[in-house]
């Protein structure tokens, strides 16, 4: 483990500071981690990492003159599971062919860059659950149709918060199994079109906090378990509760919205088929009692994956077999915002 210009320890290579002006061609091909920090790289050239069969992580951080990532930079790397590209404000262009054939990819971070479009992930084809973390890219304005097709054969988490997203097209999430979608802090985002989740499974968790979104789509929220819409002042109405059959936790802006969930009873037709199996009924009742009260989403400031990155999903949620829905909702109605005012009497309604 030795290199003339990059620091290394145990096959981890750190190429650091202004003396690094290009990706060294003589980095050992058995490296397991490569980090390029505070360098003067202007271009990451085609095939820069080809042949790194053991490479697990790449970090490209605080490279203020980086402008271009060419084709085939992150391609055909069988063990690569983490890519971090951050704090590169002059990075304006990532070639659509930059990311290809990364069967073990689990985490892709692109933050604080100048890119104008979401990276093309169609050819990544990961066999793992993927967290795509694209934050603080203020020049990204649009999410096009089919933006995430081909990212993973498994489920995906999309953290698209704090960008400049203003428009999301119908079918944007087509072809994805969407565990979580975070669109928070896209301050100019006003609309989620009705067919935005067409062709997608999920989302299970949706965060639209601190956006200007005024309504949720009518379709595609059947699997939604957690909704977070803090400081989303334009969101004045929610879809009918029949569209939110799986909802368990809601963290909203107005206390009045929580009133809708009080004593809401799910229709038998909405229950999961497994609930009809009489053999399971007793076990289901026992399990739902044993699991007790859930913690409030309002207290859950960080997303479920940010603490660790254990991508395994939970077992079947037997709470779905309860006819009476216990939706944990905040902010709770109080003396100043009582449910009676809006829900209590027909004349007031």
């Amino acid at each position: 483990c030795h290199h003339r210009i990059c620091h290394c320890s145990n096959r981890v290579f750190l190429c650091q500071e202004s003396k690094v002006t290009e990706i060294p061609s003589d980095l050992p091909r058995n490296a397991i981690e490569l980090r390029f920090v505070l360098t003067k790289l202007r271009v990451i050239q085609k095939g820069a990492f080809s042949g790194f069969g053991d490479l697990e992580k790449i970090e490209i951080s605080q490279n203020d003159v980086l402008e271009v990532i060419e084709a085939d930079v992150f391609s055909n790397l069988p063990k690569l599971h983490e890519i971090r590209i951050e704090k590169a404000n002059n990075l304006l262009y990532i070639n659509p062919e930059a990311f290809q054939n990364l069967p073990n990819l689990q985490y892709l971070l692109i933050s604080n860059t100048g890119i104008k479009h979401l990276p093309d992930v169609h050819k990544i084809h990961s066999l793992q659950k993927v967290l795509l973390d694209i934050q603080d890219n203020i020049n990204i304005h649009t999410i096009e149709r089919n933006s995430f097709v081909g990212l993973s054969f498994e489920s995906v988490i999309l953290w698209l918060n704090k960008n400049g997203i203003q428009e999301i097209h119908n079918c944007a999430f087509n072809g994805t199994q969407l565990d979580e979608l975070n669109l928070s802090d896209n301050n100019n985002l006003e609309e989620l079109p009705n067919d935005v989740f067409h062709g997608a499974s999920g989302p299970v968790i949706l965060d639209i906090s601190r956006t200007r979104i005024h309504s949720l789509p009518s379709y595609g929220l059947e699997n939604l378990k957690k909704l977070r819409a803090r400081s989303t002042y334009n969101l004045k109405k929610l879809p009918t509760l029949e569209k939110l059959v799986a909802l368990m936790e809601a963290s909203l802006t107005y206390p009045s919205h929580c009133c809708a969930f009080a004593n809401w009873r799910r229709q038998i037709s909405e229950l999961h088929p497994i609930c009809n199996k009489s053999i399971l009924r007793q076990e289901v009742d026992y399990m739902t009692q044993a699991r007790g009260q859930r913690s409030s989403l309002a207290e859950d400031n960080e997303s479920s994956y940010s603490r660790g990155f254990d991508m395994t999903y939970t077992e079947f949620d037997y709470d779905l077999c309860n006819e009476v829905v216990d939706v944990t909702c905040s902010p709770k109605p109080d003396a100043f915002n009582p449910c009676e005012d809006i829900m209590g009497y027909n004349i007031l309604r």
Epitope: H2, R4, I5, H7, C8, S9, V12, L14, K19, E59
Partner: antibody
């Protein structure tokens, strides 16, 4: 084979000046990643980094010594110099010339050293 | 400046003994997952020789009985089975930031 040979040491009075030379071979200071510098060791004491220069002429000094010590290099002769001014008794030490690799900032090869004695 | 403190200052040991020398930095010498900590051996009247770099990486040609470990502020040099030629003074050194600094040294003597 890398070799570093120091010269120019000797006895000098307090306030005086001295110029040390290090003739190196087996590597080129024009090669990316190469550096050469000085480390000193007072008699019976520990080691102290003095200064070094990288292949791109980037010079780094120990802040405690920078005002009095100056590095220069003659690439055609593969020779590093350390000009020492306003010498003090506490500058008495063996001065080692070292080859430094930018990767891990490794002191890969050392000369045998030259003794500088500052005394009246 | 980052201060480097070694312990013990000296120790007596016999051939075949396992010897450990500690080095503590006044602040972390890690940067982006790499520890900028080196170990040197110096024999009387000779220049120091690099043994270990980046805390745990053995320089080529150094006997395998020498190993390094640690991260952050606490580091250890271990000689698994002391040999007669290992009686010397050992120094740790940080190169995370200028000025690069050395420990005061640990002298390993024959018991």
């Amino acid at each position: 084979e890398v070799q570093l040979v120091e010269s120019g040491g000797g006895l000098v009075q307090p306030g005086g000046s001295l110029r040390l030379s290090c003739s190196f071979s087996g590597f080129s200071l024009s090669t990316s990643g190469m550096g050469v510098g000085w480390i000193r060791q007072a008699p019976g004491k520990g080691l102290e980094w003095v200064a070094h220069i990288w292949w791109d002429d980037d010079k780094r000094y120990n802040p405690a010594l920078k005002s009095r010590f100056t590095l220069s290099v003659d690439r055609s002769k593969n020779t590093l110099y350390l000009q020492m001014n306003s010498l003090r008794a506490e500058d008495t030490a063996t001065y080692y010339c070292v080859q430094i690799n930018y990767g891990n900032y490794r002191f890969d090869n050392w000369g045998h050293g030259t003794l500088v004695t500052v005394s009246s | 400046d980052i201060q480097m403190t070694q312990s013990p200052s000296s120790l007596s040991a016999s051939v075949g003994d396992r010897v450990t020398i500690s080095c503590r930095a006044s602040e972390s010498v890690d940067n982006y997952g790499i520890s900028f900590l080196n170990w040197f051996q110096q024999k009387p009247g000779k220049a120091p020789k690099l043994l270990i770099y980046a805390a745990s990486n053995q320089r080529s040609g150094v006997p395998s009985r020498f190993s390094g470990s640690g991260s952050g502020t606490d580091f250890t040099l271990t000689i698994s089975s002391l040999q007669p030629e290992d009686f010397a003074t050992y120094f740790c050194q940080q190169s995370k930031e200028v000025p690069w600094t050395f420990g005061q040294g640990t002298k390993v003597e024959i018991k």
